[in-house]
């Protein structure tokens, strides 16, 4: 591509499934157009969470996103969600220079689209293209558990990947089930992992300009089955106005696959509790932990009667656990007064 | 309430040994990785070691490699550091402190600390 | 010890906005979160903001932070009195001296 020419998705309609998550590499300089849904009907783009307006340098604009020339700061990801929803029409993340990587191993690598100027670029030393995938460093899975460590990195001339043991050379070759090295993701596959896995793992990337390097620290667990663990202090007790958009947030960790519940605490006949001595609560979300965004319940444009006791529900084959926050909403005319929720801020509780 | 509560600390002969034990109460101990950190009088903070949930992975700090032994007994919620040949420049307050993935891999839990003397 | 480097002191009155900087290295701040501790006078250090301004619970949003390549900084706005403390920025390294490395620490003055 000549840097005049754009980037474009085509055809300007909601993508098939195969393109909901791409990787895009784009020359400095170049001008960017893609679509997502229909003219008026598109969805808006988002940069790293925040909408993008309809006006300037980069915009997003009747389900168009615009960048009139592509600079270094608008590497990063962009989502397309779908108007008045949380459907993700569109996934992607756009790179700097001219070097692929994977945003997920599963990928057909023909969704890649390397969008680069192919004239000579400057040499430039390795560097991380997605350093928010490699924000972990500190890892204990399972025995059994298939570990994966990736290191995604980018430079010119195209860096190479290797990796390291406990500071020594690491082919997996005395590994019982081997090792794969998938070098065009950056990627450290090692299934069922065993208490010998347990060790420093160092991905070092490198090419004739530099060489940068990463640790993941592994531990391997001895399976000690128990119930869902909570992180404590979610969900967190929150207060909106009435007419606001509220997200409640549970942190769910289990070995065993666990099932996730929102409840809401009602009212019946004047009572909150039943015969059983059960709270009456009404379940307004239920999945595993493998769906998307289960963990967030989404309350949008709450009205006085949202106003609450919610709970996080999660059980596994071991045991339940679960807790609790309230939600305070104020009117809008009067966003000064406040009210309190009672005393136990965020509680929580286990049973088998 | 989750807490960590350090003990063990005294004053202490140059080659000396001492055995640093810290309680932990109010979370599952089992499932973080646990590290000291350390602070000379009037200094600022050394990180010194972490050890992983199993207890099966350890890393030193370069300054105490050879010398200091971190450990842990799971059946007892304590995290332990044993300082052999101690020298002056591990006079120190000694904290141990708990790694949490929810908080990227930081120190989010600090116990009060325990004053380690080496001297003659 | 490997250390980041902080200034060693920095100041204001109530209400004002204090910038603190913690330069580091690329195998350090350069490819790793950087985590801030708040050190209260005669007190253990305690989390303060980590990641991409996440705070734990209590922390007031007065508290921001920012990273560019290998340098980070933490500002406090609306400056109070009870921020006055010891700041420390830490990361993970992945050099082979270190593993885990503080900053030298940055004392913050409230004045008047």
């Known amino acids: 591509l000549e840097a005049s020419e754009e980037v474009e998705l085509e055809p300007c309609l909601a993508p098939s499934l195969e393109q909901q998550e791409q990787e895009l590499t784009v020359a400095l300089g170049q001008p960017v157009r893609l679509c997502c849904g229909r003219a008026e009907r598109g969805g808006h783009w988002y940069k790293e969470g925040s909408r993008l307006a309809p006006a300037g340098r980069v915009r997003g604009w009747r389900g168009r996103l615009e960048i009139a020339s592509f600079l270094p700061e608008d590497a990063g990801r962009y989502l397309c969600l779908a108007r008045g929803s949380m459907i993700v029409l569109q996934n992607l993340t756009l790179i700097t220079g001219d070097s692929l990587t994977s945003s997920n191993d599963d990928e057909d690598p023909k969704s890649h689209r390397d969008l680069s100027n192919r004239h000579s670029y400057p040499q430039q030393a390795p560097y991380w293209t997605h350093p928010q995938r490699m924000e972990k460093k500190l890892h204990a899975v399972p025995a059994g558990n298939t570990v994966k460590f990736r290191c995604p990195a980018a430079g010119n001339p195209t860096p190479t990947i290797r990796w390291l043991k406990d500071g020594q050379a690491f082919h997996g070759e005395n590994r019982i089930g081997g090792i794969r090295l998938r070098h065009q993701h950056w990627s450290l596959v090692m299934e069922s992992v065993v208490p010998s896995d347990r060790g420093t793992y160092t991905c070092l990337v490198e090419n004739a300009v530099g060489s940068i390097r990463y640790n993941y620290l592994l531990d391997v667990l001895e399976r000690s089955p128990h119930r869902p663990i909570l992180q404590a202090g979610l969900p967190a007790n929150t207060t909106a106005v009435v007419g606001s958009d509220v997200e409640l947030l549970c942190k769910v960790y289990s070995d065993a696959q666990p099932h996730i519940q929102w409840l809401k605490h009602i009212v019946i006949n004047g009572s909150s509790f039943g015969a059983d001595g059960f709270p009456y609560v009404q379940v307004l979300k239920t999945a595993d932990i493998n769906s998307s965004e289960v963990e967030v319940l989404y309350l949008r444009n709450v009205s006085a009667e949202d106003a609450g006791e919610y709970t996080c529900l999660a059980g596994n084959s071991i045991g339940l656990s679960y807790q609790s926050a309230w939600l305070t909403v104020l009117p809008e005319e009067d966003p000064t007064w406040t009210a309190a929720a009672p005393e136990a801020a965020s509680h929580h509780h286990h049973h088998h | 309430e989750v807490q960590l509560l350090e003990s063990g600390g005294g004053l202490v002969q140059p080659g000396g040994s001492l055995r640093l034990s810290c309680a932990a109460s109010?979370?599952?101990?089992?499932?973080?990785?646990m590290g000291w950190v350390r602070q000379a009088p009037g200094k600022g903070l050394e990180w010194v070691s972490v050890?992983?949930?199993?207890?099966?992975?350890?890393i030193y700090a370069d300054s105490v490699k050879g010398r200091f032994t971190i450990s842990r007994d799971n059946s007892k919620n304590t995290l332990y550091l044993q300082m052999n040949s101690l020298r002056a420049e591990d006079t120190a307050v000694y904290y141990c402190?708990?790694?949490?993935?929810?908080?990227?891999?930081?120190?989010?839990?600090w116990g009060q600390g325990t004053m380690v003397t080496v001297s003659s | 010890q490997y250390e980041l480097t902080q200034p060693p002191s920095a100041s204001g009155t109530p209400g004002q906005r204090v910038t603190i900087s913690c330069s580091g290295s690329?195998?350090?701040?350069?490819?790793?979160?950087v985590h801030w501790y708040q050190q209260l006078p005669g007190t253990a250090p305690k989390l303060l903001i980590y990641?991409?301004?996440q705070r734990p619970s209590g922390v007031p949003d007065r508290f921001s932070v920012s990273k560019s390549g290998s340098s980070a900084s933490l500002a406090i706005s609306g400056l109070q009195s009870e921020d006055e403390a010891d700041y420390y920025c830490?990361?993970?390294?992945?050099?082979?001296?270190?593993?885990?490395?503080f900053g030298t620490g940055t004392k913050v003055t409230v004045l008047g």
């Open positions: 402190a708990r790694s949490s993935g929810w908080a990227l891999d930081a120190f989010d839990i």
């Open positions: 109010g979370f599952t101990f089992s499932h973080y990785w």
């Open positions: 050890i992983s949930p199993s207890g099966g992975l350890t």
């Open positions: 690329s195998s350090n701040i350069g490819s790793n979160i």
């Open positions: 990641g991409n301004n």
């Open positions: 830490a990361s993970w390294d992945d050099s082979l001296k270190a593993f885990y490395v």
